[in-house]
């Protein structure tokens, strides 16, 4: 178990021409807040994939009012870190989405209004317990600067938070075969229940006797880097079973290389061979290159041969954004007939048909809805001789002519907070609830008769998949 921490340093106009207008004005003062969504692994991001590692919302930032005539400065930020607790092993590789939201504080009917200002996404490798990694991401004309790290919650330690520490039984030394627990030198490593010999740096287990490898490592004991099949250390007696050399004690013990780097000895000390995307003496500095696969949805990465040069994602048809993370509106192909309104739902195209028409592409004439006009993309729904308008998100009333706050219907259950923007609704759940609408109380294992989860339990729930 542990916590992913995100520190936002600045959010403001990026370099170059086309500086964005300030999101706030004297008439509409506003303040910012941020949402982070974490997913495990480097797999392509599914359009509706949940924030399976967890999600978090920041506090609101200070109220900001634009000074007339002044360029948009870096905007005032919320205090503190965004913290996403994770319960299982830290996966080592993860995808993130960071959203910048604006809360307008003008004379809004029904309270403040929220809108999404910018959204950045990326994929990174990160070892728990390492230093802060710095990053810069751009979304349109906006630039977001931030740092992040993953740290283990005691008693867990290690790059995946899978090793356990416990207080020393004697003040002088740890028990037989147990090492001091860096960085908690006054504690000792708890006996591992993993398979004997399983690498404490590169392997972990969720059940006794198994040895599962972090990305970049292989072999029955997770001691072999994926990049090479030969052994790294030239010392020690030969092992007949693997043909490898078993290292004795040396400067590489405990692997000082972060982020999956492999250690080799030098005459004076050690040297880290870093995976692509990381550099520095101990591979502690992260820089993203094309080799890290930063382009989502099959995008082609160009440039970025070294971490200091930028990469560019050339997106396939249907996707856009600096990381090809946004879907292009496929409705430009005009698939809806008879004047139907096309909606791109991500996983499918949908046609909202004009009154009198129905079918997946509005190809069928209907009598029940003839002469019945639903405005703003509403659909006339017929059934049993009756007909009504089923309104698109954000509209209501008999003919869908009235603007409606999607959150006014209170879709979030059990005290969840609702946020609305162009692609749908977001529910931020209160502790102890899960589901996109926070509709399910979490019942911890073996306690299914309880009415809800105990206070303070935070499920790593998908919430809404933006």
């Amino acid at each position: 178990a542990g916590v992913f921490e995100l520190q936002i340093h600045s959010f403001g106009p990026g370099p170059g021409p086309g500086a964005p207008r300030s999101p706030c004005s004297a008439r509409l003062p506003c303040r910012l807040f941020f949402r982070v969504c974490l997913k495990p692994g480097l797999s392509e991001e599914a359009a509706e994939s949940p924030c399976a590692l967890g999600a978090a919302l920041s506090a609101r930032g200070p109220v900001y009012t634009e000074q007339p005539g002044a360029p948009a400065p870096d905007l005032p930020l919320p205090d503190g870190l965004l913290q996403v607790p994770f319960r299982d092993a830290w996966p080592g590789t993860f995808s993130f989405i960071i959203e910048t939201w604006r809360e307008e504080l003008g004379d809004q009917i029904g309270g403040p209004a929220w809108s999404l200002l910018a959204r950045v996404a990326g994929r990174r490798r990160l070892a728990a317990g390492g230093p802060w990694a710095r990053d810069i991401q751009r979304a349109g004309a906006w630039e977001l600067r931030f740092s992040y790290r993953a740290r283990c919650e005691p008693p867990a330690v290690g790059t995946a938070c899978t090793r356990l520490c416990r207080p020393r039984s004697a003040p002088s030394r740890c028990g037989p075969g147990l090492r001091p627990c860096a960085p908690l030198e006054d504690e000792c490593e708890a006996p591992l229940v993993c398979r004997a010999g399983c690498s404490p740096e590169h392997g972990f287990c969720e059940q006794p006797g198994e040895c599962r490898c972090l990305e970049g490592w292989t072999g029955p004991l997770c001691t072999v880097p994926v990049s090479t099949s030969s052994c790294l250390s030239p010392r020690g007696p030969s092992s007949a079973t693997t043909g490898c050399l078993v290292p004795g004690p040396g400067p590489c013990d405990g692997n000082p290389c972060a982020n999956g780097g492999s250690c080799s000895e030098t005459p004076r000390s050690f040297e880290c061979t870093c995976p692509r995307g990381f550099y520095g003496l101990r591979c502690e500095v992260s820089g993203v290159t094309c080799a890290d696969g930063p382009c989502f949805n099959g995008g082609l990465c160009v440039g970025g041969a070294d971490p200091d040069s930028a990469y560019i994602c050339h997106c396939p048809p249907g996707f856009q954004g600096s990381n090809c993370e946004k879907r292009v509106d496929r409705c430009s192909l005009q698939p809806c007939r008879n004047g139907g309104l096309c909606l791109d739902l991500g996983h499918a195209l949908r046609c909202r048909c004009r009154a009198g028409f129905a079918g997946p592409r509005c190809e069928h004439d209907l009598d029940d809805c003839a002469g019945r006009a639903c405005a703003n993309g509403g659909t006339c729904v017929e059934g049993g001789g009756a007909h009504r308008c089923s309104c698109a998100l954000g509209f209501g009333g008999r003919d869908c002519r009235e603007r409606a706050d999607p959150c006014a219907a209170r879709p979030c259950a059990h005290g969840g907070r609702c946020y609305a923007h162009f692609s749908g609704l977001v529910c931020a759940c209160a502790p102890g609830y899960m589901g996109a609408r926070c509709e399910f109380p979490v019942h911890p294992d073996g306690a299914s008769a309880l009415p809800a989860a105990p206070p303070g339990l935070r499920p790593g729930d998908p919430q809404r998949y933006l």
Epitope: P40, S43, A46, E48, S49, P50, A52, L53, R87, D88, L343, L345, T379, V381, S390, L393, P406, A409, P411, A413, G424, L425, C427, M434, G435, A436, R437, E439, F440, P441, V442, H443, P444, D445, S448, P459, G460, D461, P462, R464, Y465
Partner: antibody, heavy 122, light 106 residues
Framework: EVRLVQSGAEVKKPGASVKVSCKAS????????MNWVRQAPGQSLEWMGI????????SYNQKFRGRVTLTVDKSASTAYMELSSLRSEDTAVYYC???????????????WGQGTTVTVSS | DIVMTQSPKSLAVSLGERATINCKAS?????VSWYQQKPGQSPKLLIY???NRYTGVPDRFSGSGSATDFTLTISSLQAEDVAVYHC?????????FGQGTKLEIK
Amino acid sequence: EVRLVQSGAEVKKPGASVKVSCKASGYTFTDYYMNWVRQAPGQSLEWMGIINPYQGDTSYNQKFRGRVTLTVDKSASTAYMELSSLRSEDTAVYYCARYHYGPHLEGYFDVWGQGTTVTVSS
Amino acid sequence: DIVMTQSPKSLAVSLGERATINCKASENVGYVSWYQQKPGQSPKLLIYGASNRYTGVPDRFSGSGSATDFTLTISSLQAEDVAVYHCGQSYSYPLTFGQGTKLEIK
């Protein structure tokens, strides 16, 4: 093709436990909640519970009073439903069903397993 | 728990004719989904969000209603539509279903 394939029929004695498996394929297992729904002979559908396959968080129908346990094996893309202290009225077909959300956050079961018949008889 | 009541319990309709099944919730559920279950098979999704037809479902199936009263309509009954139809609500925990409506050919 998205598929949920369940384990075979089971015959159990009253008081015993049964564990039914549901193997998912054709999609990323951890991207969708998994539900369990049962149907007794000649009866309607009855929701038993839901699990978040990545975190393992669960929510159960109180009717089952702690008798049901939902688990997953992420590496095998498989969900499990264990029902203990079986009685004759637990004789039913047990289904796993993937949970999906529409644009207004309306939840629905879009893919169902083929069902596993559990017979409880002395 | 929210009680979902379907009517009628069984229904016989001639081929090509319209079939209508109702579902009433004991309190506001916002929307329902409809499932078709043929003999010996698992349920299949037809309609979600009260009126959205699921991918691949023929357009003779339509759903309507809101709050507590919902309707599934088959505009022109086909032989392959013989099945039990279930409504279900996912608005409120615990999720609940109607008792089912058996549709046959007259």
